[in-house]
Every structure is written in C-alpha cells, then in structure tokens.
C-alpha cells in the first residue's frame, strides 16, 4: 500500500514560521500577511517505526521537492540537514532511520524527536531568522514545541 501523507506547515511555540534559507537549510522567523507564502509546506509521511498513542513515526519531506529532513552525525554531533533523495523511491513506508522523527503530542503541542538520536529534537532558537537545528535539550531556551497547520493538497 502507498504511504499515507498529509501536507502541513509548522510553527514553533513563539509563532515563528519555517522558511528556506539557502538550498539545504530551514530557518525560523515571524511572518505576516503576504510573507506567509514563504513558509515551507511539508509532506508529512506516516512511516514504519515504534508507535504508541502519543508517539507516531513520520518523515518530513518538502512538498513537491525531493528534499527530506534527516539526522546525521557531523563532527561527532547529531545534526539536522535537508537531504536530497531520488523522487522515484520516496516517500516509502520503510524510510531509513535518519529520515524518521517520532511525532510526540503533548498538550496540543508537537515535538519531533529524532529516531536515529533519541532525546534530540527539531529545534528553533528564541532569536529571529536563525536556522532550524537538532537540539539535545527540552524545556531550555531552545524551542522544541510546534503546532501543525493542515494545508489542502
């Protein structure tokens, strides 16, 4: 069966939107009005992995682009990147672990934990216009809580 996907945008708990920053990076900033069109639309695919009531494994692709968020070691540090894939083979139900995030719902907020690196989360900073990254703490000054807005296909 084909993998189930939905289109959505994400905003952090400070209401910062996610936009492209160069060809292989995302950044977070406050957008208003027409600028909202800049925000990236994700194709969130529901993939194979450990699942529970509040934890669902997903892959986060960029809609109509052959780019997926992935988690890899760079200089011995878990790092978030946008990785180019062959569109003929993706998305798929059994995604490589680096592409998988555990979508965790807590109090109507979402966290995205790396399946490859447990306790590392998609994060933004308090500062404006700075990259989205993989952070190793929750509840500190880095932001790990997001809301999801559905986008019609």
């Amino acid at each position: 069966a084909p993998v189930r996907s939905l289109n959505c945008t994400l905003r952090d708990s400070q209401q910062k939107s996610l936009v492209m920053s160069g060809p292989y990076e995302l950044k977070a900033l406050h957008l208003q009005g027409q600028d909202m069109e800049q925000q990236v639309v994700f194709s969130m695919s529901f993939v194979q992995g450990e699942e529970s009531n509040d934890k669902i494994p997903v892959a986060l692709g960029l809609k109509e682009k052959n780019l997926y968020l992935s988690c890899v070691l760079k200089d011995d540090k878990p790092t978030l990147q946008l990785e180019s894939v062959d569109p003929k083979n993706y998305p798929k139900k059994k995604m490589e672990k680096r592409f998988v995030f555990n979508k965790i719902e807590i109090n109507n907020k979402l966290e995205f934990e790396s399946a490859q690196f447990p306790n590392w989360y998609i994060s933004t900073s308090q500062a404006e216009n700075m990259p989205v990254f993989l952070g190793g703490t929750k509840g500190g000054q880095d932001i790990t809580d997001f809301t999801m807005q559905f986008v019609s296909s």
Epitope: S21, G22, E25, K27, L29, K77, S123, S125, Q126, A127, E128, N129, M130, P131, F133, L134, G135, G136, T137, G140, Q141, D142
Partner: antibody, heavy 118, light 107 residues
Framework: EVQLLESGGGLVQPGGSLRLSCAAS????????MFWVRQAPGKGLEWVSV????????RYADSVKGRFTISRDNSKNTLYLQMNSLRAEDTAVYYC???????????WGQGTLVTVSS | DIQMTQSPSSVSASVGDRLTIICRAS??????LAWYQQTPGNAPKLLIH???SLQSGVPSRFSGSGSGTDFTLTINSLQPEDFATYYC?????????FGGGTKVEIK
C-alpha cells in the same frame, strides 16, 4: 556596558594550533548567538563561525570547515575558537561579536591578531 | 553562497557632501542586510540593520534603503568622523557574507 575581550592570538607555524577566547560582560551572554569574524591585513571582513546560545547550533565558513571549532562556556561567559591545521591564509585579526536582531553583529571586541608564518 | 557586491570601492568626498553607497546581493535577501563603519585600527561598528533600521546611538544622517537585491547606504552631510570604510553584510542565510567595502576618503 557591553564588552567583548578577545585573547589567545599570536604567532604560530603553519600546521599549528591556537585557541582564541572571548570574555563577555555587560549582558546576559547565555541568551545570545555569537560570531567570530576575521579580517586579513589590509583586506575586508570575513565571517568565520556562529554558535547558538545553547551551543547546539554551529555553522562555519567553507574556508575553515573541519579545521576550526567554535564553542562556549555560558557559566564563564566565554566564547572560544579552536583553530587547528593553521595556514598562512588564516593570518588575520579575529573579532568576536554579539549577534543582534536577525543576524547582524551589534557589538564587537577589539580583535586579536593571529599570524601564521614559518 | 550569496555574493555581496559594493560600489564604489572607494570615493573621495568633502565635509558636507551627501554620499550614497550601493550594495547588491547575488540573490534575493529580503531585508536581511546590515551596514557597518570601520575606522583604521578599530573594530567595525553597526550602523543599520534590517536594511533600514538605524542602530541605537547612530546619528540620523545615516540612512539605509532597499530590499531584495539592491540596497543603499546614504550619509547626509558628511562629517569629519565619517571618513572610514563601510561594509554591507547579508544575514539571509549562512554562510554570512560581506561586501568588499567602500573606502570614503577626504577630497
């Protein structure tokens, strides 16, 4: 008053290492992104590296990637730049700078000179 | 990487002149542009951020304009302390990049 004071520069042979420090005061260091920016003698400004307040997010210029490492100790209000495999073209004044709104450098240190020569 | 091109690279002017420096980005950087002033032997000083916002404490004779790829720094009525080198810097994406600088000399 915001103050940034770099130290650790000096003369080093090609292939050698240096560790620069930047002592910060007059603001809540742990809340700010920080940059290293360099300026070769008689040349323009070149951005080198950035680190987030928590230290989890770092980025580097291609010219130093794999050789330089930025880090910070928020308990000591200090920013660091570990420089390995130094080359003649790394000769420059190295400035640390506090990152202001949206990615500008709103306060700068006085700089420390690194000379790579045999 | 985004290339930043400044013009002119140097200019001679007199006290009281109105001076315009141009900075062009190789791609759209929205309004994520800063301007700095540097005098010999000193660290750069932030003048303008977000293309048009005057940094606190900077005299109002300095102003910035533009968005997208084309930006200008204007100095109305040059003062003796304004003879320096000016740099633009894009903050749209990493790696951050600076223009090559514009040296303003006394005529």
């Amino acid at each position: 008053e915001v103050q940034l004071l770099e130290s650790g520069g000096g003369l080093v042979q090609p292939g050698g290492s240096l560790r620069l420090s930047c002592a910060a005061s007059g603001f809540t260091f742990s809340k700010y992104f920080m940059f290293w920016v360099r300026q070769a003698p008689g040349k323009g400004l070149e951005w080198v590296s950035v680190i987030s307040p928590s230290g989890y997010m770092t980025r580097y210029a291609d010219s130093v990637k794999g050789r330089f490492t930025i880090s910070r100790d928020n308990s000591k209000n200090t920013l660091y730049l570990q420089m390995n495999s130094l080359r003649a073209e790394d000769t420059a004044v190295y400035y640390c700078a506090r990152v202001g709104y949206g990615g500008n450098s709103d306060y700068w240190g006085q700089g420390t000179l690194v000379t790579v020569s045999s | 990487d985004i290339q930043m091109t400044q013009s002119p690279s140097s200019v001679s002017a007199s006290v009281g002149d109105r001076l315009t420096i141009i900075c062009r980005a190789s791609q759209d950087i929205n309004r994520w542009l800063a301007w700095y002033q540097q005098t010999p032997g000193n660290a750069p000083k932030l003048l303008i951020h977000s293309a048009t916002s005057l940094q606190s404490g900077v005299p109002s004779r300095f102003s910035g304009s533009g968005s997208g790829t084309d930006f200008t720094l204007t100095i109305n009525s040059l003062q003796p302390e304004d003879f320096a080198t000016y740099y633009c810097q894009q903050a749209d994406s990493f790696p951050l990049t600076f223009g090559g600088g514009t040296k303003v000399e006394i005529k």
